[in-house]
């Protein structure tokens, strides 16, 4: 049987290395060895290139070397495929070797900020020495920010024939590292070279950002004062390496700015004591580049009433996130703070917040959260400087088994009835839900009883037991990953109520 | 349409000189390596010369290496052959032609170059 | 050197076909392109089949271009001949060892009655 007919030539130039076509069948049924023969110098000249019985038989790619590689040329490609039954001939294909040239890729040698031009880096690099001189080549740069994943493009070419070339890229962020890797081709090629190595630069620093600033309103004191804690944080978008040397904060009751009030800080929160009043809070970051533009926060008075429109609220967990959704009666707000934090019977330890704007969910990467931790979650509206009712939930982003069981007390023993009473696991070793709690009992060498009831009953009366009797009873408390008993308990029941009169028959 | 049209040829004497020329029309010259390709009197044809699209790299058959030299000039879309120290057994039609891959593809009609004393 | 030979001159019947040959005499023929150029009396050459076995489109189908591997030949095959036919044929290769063209001596053909 004849060989197939090769097909699929596909021929690269690997500039100053090598010409070198592949195609298929890669493989034949029977012993097959190649013929490619090419016509070069514009078809002047023809030469063969052979994968030769005995090392590359059966191997469906062949190279052509230098010195007969010149360039720029059309090229003639056809392969001939031979075993013992005979030969079969390609389609003659053509190649222009400007159109397949394939090149080393630059060197970037430096990724630096041109002093006093903002988000802006120059990128230098040095042309492939393997590169055609005279040709214009045209480059993909790639970039990133440090800390992301994802690649941005540009695209542009040179057409000088200098040893290091440059580029500004424009419109980045502010004080922020970016990692840019370069590559390039002849303009005409569908070839590009690999990327260059990576090589990281920093935009120069600029005045602060901005900030987000929220606070927790506390109750009144006795006195009357109010405290509220400030809080802010860089704002969405900031640059990550942005560094403030400081913060100053002023304040003043609505319509009253001879009572402004300021402060200076080098923290992210402050607490504020404030009268019943409607007061305007305002805070700028600074470094030695100027200030942020002014964030702003209005306090509501101690009476005001605050409107209310999340009318639902679900936590639900995908594979890594924890998605929060809401429904709002109020088409109009469509900016809400959300506050987390843990549900622990202590102070919280660690606060968090953050502003959502244009949707009416949140998500959060389920690691950012511990597991067996209750969290709490609230959203509050926000309309322009209003901010109106929160609604809140919990969550846990995993669940455990509880970390201990209830403590559990017999009350009330009677003859045929005990009470059973038992403490809420405090919030620390919940590990979940409590979903519900059952109730094991077993008289001495008897058969096991079991009673199950919702997790809001902390209480349960037995009854039909046997007079007289020792049981043993112990507690589990149960989340959706499964229970822990709490510590086994002994009671008898009595031989007699306590309440039954006593008569005494005489004979 | 393409077209080849030789001129220059003439009788010379044995050890002369002669320049040949052959203007192209119809096609994109400098893109293409040409050739002067000879016929003596009843006899088969012979490859005189080729040249480069740029005109960088020059061919010869070996025997007319060091007495004849092929040119071109793109922007006049002109290809010359400059014969000297010419000899009898140069007397031939000499025809200029354009090559395709790996062959003639357009001939002009060719120049009479006759070397006799 | 490898040198194309070719048998001085052919005579073939009108209607009939004429087989061409172009042996090569060092070399394998199959490693190089033969063309085959057709010559009238008065005119220069024409090409009629290239690179193995091309026809350019304004030649007649009659003419085809193959290769004899065992005779390590190039082939001319017209078929149907006609007295237009009559003509002298060149093959033609590449030969790396000149680095140029080299032209077999050519072969006459005759188209008989």
């Known amino acids: 049987v004849l060989p197939a007919k090769p097909e699929n030539i596909s021929c690269i130039f690997y500039y100053e290395e090598n010409f070198t076509c592949t195609w298929s069948p890669e493989k034949e049924a029977s012993y097959t060895w190649y013929k490619v023969k090419r016509t070069y110098s514009y078809g002047y000249k023809s030469d063969i290139c052979s994968t030769d019985n005995s090392t590359r038989g059966n191997h469906a790619s062949c190279s052509f070397l230098p010195p007969t590689i010149t360039n720029p040329d059309n090229y003639t490609i056809q392969v001939e495929a031979q075993n013992a039954d005979g030969i079969m001939k390609s389609d003659i294909t053509y190649w222009n070797l400007d159109a397949i040239m394939k090149i080393e890729p630059p060197e970037i040698f430096s990724v630096k900020s041109v002093l006093g031009i903002k988000r802006m880096l120059q990128i230098k690099w040095i042309r492939p020495v393997l590169a055609p001189h005279s040709s214009t080549l045209k480059y993909t740069l790639r970039f990133r920010t440090i800390n992301s994943a994802y690649w941005m493009e540009v695209n542009f070419t040179k057409e000088d024939i200098d040893r290091d070339e440059t580029y500004n890229l424009t419109e980045l962020q502010a004080f922020t590292e970016y990692v840019m890797t370069l590559r390039c081709a002849p303009a005409e090629s569908m070839f590009w070279s690999g990327w260059s190595q990576e090589k990281v630069g920093t935009t120069e620093e600029e005045a602060p950002y901005g900030l987000d600033l929220w606070r927790v309103l506390k109750p009144a004191m006795v006195d009357g004062r109010r405290p509220v804690q400030l809080m802010w944080k860089k704002a969405t978008g900031a640059p990550v390496l942005e560094k403030a040397l400081g913060y100053n904060i002023w304040y003043f009751p609505e319509n009253n700015t001879n009572l402004t009030e300021t402060v200076n800080t080098t923290n992210q929160t402050h607490e504020l004591y404030l009268g019943g009043k409607t007061y305007w809070v305002y805070v700028v970051s600074y470094n030695s580049l100027g200030e942020s533009p002014v964030a702003t926060l209005r306090i509501p008075a101690l009476n005001e009433k605050t409107f209310q429109c999340i009318e639902a609220m679900q936590a639900c967990l995908t594979q890594d996130q924890l998605v929060v959704e809401w429904q709002s009666s109020a088409p109009e707000v469509d900016t809400w703070m959300v506050e987390w934090f843990p549900d622990v019977d202590s102070e919280p330890s660690s606060f968090s917040w953050e502003s959502v704007s244009q949707a009416r969910n949140w998500t959060i990467q389920k690691d950012e959260l511990k597991p067996l931790w209750c969290y709490n979650i609230s959203v509050y509206p926000v309309l322009r400087d209003r901010v109106g009712q929160p609604y809140s939930t919990q969550a846990y982003v995993q669940e455990g088994i509880p970390s201990a069981g209830p403590v559990t007390q017999a009350d009330s023993i009677g003859v045929k009835t005990v009470t059973i009473t038992w403490k809420e696991i405090p919030k620390s070793k919940r590990n979940g839900f409590i979903k519900n709690y059952t109730i094991f009992y077993q008289a001495e060498d008897g058969k096991e009883f079991s009673k199950t009831v919702n997790s809001n009953i902390l209480q349960y009366r037995l009854e039909s037991l046997t007079r007289r009797t020792s049981y043993s009873l112990q507690v589990m408390a149960s989340t959706n990953a499964g229970g822990t008993n709490g510590t086994k308990i002994n009671f008898k029941t009595l031989s007699i109520s306590h309440h039954h009169h006593h008569h005494h028959h005489h004979h | 349409e393409v077209q080849l049209v030789e001129s220059g040829g003439d009788l010379v004497k044995p050890g002369g000189s002669l320049r040949l020329s052959c203007v192209a029309s119809g096609f994109t010259f400098s893109n293409y390596y040409m050739a002067w390709v000879r016929q003596a009197p009843g006899k088969g044809l012979q490859w005189v010369a080729s040249?480069?699209?740029?005109?960088?790299?020059?061919y010869y058959r070996d025997s007319v290496k060091g007495r004849f030299t092929i040119s071109r000039d793109n922007a006049k879309n002109t290809l010359y052959l400059q014969m000297n120290s010419l000899r009898a057994e140069d007397t031939a039609m000499y025809y200029c032609a354009k090559h395709g891959t790996l062959y003639f593809d357009y001939w002009g009609q060719g120049t009479l170059v006759t070397v006799s004393s | 050197q490898p040198v194309l030979t070719q048998p001085p001159s052919l005579s073939a019947s009108l209607g009939t076909t004429a087989r061409l040959t172009c042996e090569r005499s060092s070399g394998d023929i199959g490693d190089s392109y033969v063309s085959w150029y057709q010559q009238k009396p008065g005119s220069p050459p024409r090409d009629v089949i290239y690179?193995?076995?091309?026809?350019p489109s304004e030649v007649s189908k009659s003419f085809s271009g193959s290769k004899d591997t065992s005779a390590n030949a190039g082939l001319l095959l017209i078929s149907g001949l006609q007295p237009e036919d009559e003509a002298d044929y060149f093959c033609?290769?590449?030969?790396?060892?000149?680095?140029?063209?080299?032209f077999g001596g050519g072969t006459h053909l005759t188209v008989l009655g």
């Open positions: 690179v193995d076995d091309q026809r």
């Open positions: 040249i480069s699209t740029g005109g960088g790299n020059t």
């Open positions: 033609q290769s590449y030969d790396s060892n000149i680095d140029g063209p080299v």
